[in-house]
Interface confidence: low
Amino acid sequence: MMTGTIETTGNISAEKGGSIILQCHLSSTTAQVTQVNWEQQDQLLAICNADLGWHISPSFKDRVAPGPGLGLTLQSLTVNDTGEYFCIYHTYPDGTYTGRIFLEVLESSVAEHGARFQIP
């Protein structure tokens, strides 16, 4: 039975040209995390594999930095980065958990810096 839950940074906003950290936290399960995928709608941004480490998709390598923790840092944000982001936790023996984050990239200087959670 899948008992875990994913906490995310939720709906967040950031300034155009700035940076933001996307963060998910899997709790309430003793399952082992084998891999975390970060996806933007239908595109793979990055993979963090427990054995192989990080892989950033070539088309994003200049604007995506791994971490902190299992999170993902997006840099040099553009308005086109607005949209849904998904953290997909592959675990054993539970299976797959998915968290959703909505990022809005704003022109103004009043954008919120999103919350994030520490990965133990």
Epitope: I20, I21, P68, A111, H113, G114, A115, I119
Partner: antibody
Framework: QVQLQQPGAELVKPGASVKMSCKAS????????INWVKQRPGQGLEWIGD????????NYNGEFKSKATLTLDTSSSTAYMQLSSLTSEDSAVYYC?????????WGAGTTVTVSS | DILLTQSPAILSVSPGERVSFSCRAS??????IQWYQQRTNGSPRLLIK???ESISGIPSRFSGSGSGTDFTLSINSVESEDIADYYC?????????FGGGTKLEIK
């Protein structure tokens, strides 16, 4: 303009506790993380932890988990750090700073002196 | 924790010279590095974020470079007001950590 205001100094006795403040102004307090950083005389900088005023989430450096407690009063846009069971090792300047990963605004620091 | 090692501990340069500060991380951290200046009895001031991104209000003579484990802060023409301690800081893993600092002196 964006500012973080801290009291200049605190003199406390060994074994006691101290609670210092960091009052924010010039921006939306609930939108930015507040960090706390320690600097002993003549030494470098140590990150203690941070707190997100929008949701009250905290993260601590393991070395300070039993020493520091971070709290908020969002009604007055003020962050607090309490240090407990003080010793001479806790004598330092404590800065609050704003930011997520990088710290773009800093307070002037509170000098804590632990002395009997 | 990620260890940041700054070298040298002290740099001594003449006004107008170019100077470079080194920061080495104990593991690869992408470009998750910041640089701060701290003048005597002052608070730290953010100079560079995410390795090379400039900060509003910071003179253009300050620049950052590097990725992975090796990072550099450069001042292309040192002025007397640049006398200070310089610290790197990583935001790749918690806890955030700082380097030990490099003191800039003017000859």
């Amino acid at each position: 303009q964006v500012q973080l205001q801290q009291p200049g100094a605190e003199l406390v006795k060994p074994g006691a506790s101290v609670k210092m403040s960091c009052k924010a102004s010039g921006y939306t307090f609930t939108s930015f993380w507040i960090n706390w950083v320690k600097q002993r005389p003549g030494q470098g900088l140590e990150w203690i932890g941070d707190i997100y005023p929008g949701r009250g989430i905290t993260n601590y450096n393991g070395e300070f988990k039993s020493k520091a407690t971070l709290t908020l009063d969002t009604s007055s846009s003020t962050a607090y750090m309490q240090l407990s069971s003080l010793t001479s090792e806790d004598s330092a300047v404590y800065y609050c700073s704003r930011g997520l990963g990088y710290f773009d605004v800093w307070g002037a620091g509170t000098t804590v002196t632990v002395s009997s | 924790d990620i260890l940041l090692t700054q070298s040298p501990a002290i740099l001594s340069v003449s006004p107008g010279e170019r100077v470079s500060f080194s920061c080495r991380a104990s593991q690869s951290i992408g470009t998750s590095i910041q640089w701060y200046q701290q003048r005597t009895n002052g608070s730290p001031r953010l100079l560079i974020k995410y390795g090379s991104e400039s900060i509003s209000g910071i003179p253009s003579r300050f620049s950052g470079s590097g990725s992975g484990t090796d990072f550099t802060l450069s001042i292309n023409s040192v002025e007397s007001e640049d006398i200070a301690d310089y610290y790197c800081q990583q935001s790749y893993r918690w806890p955030y950590t700082f380097g030990g600092g490099t003191k800039l002196e003017i000859k």
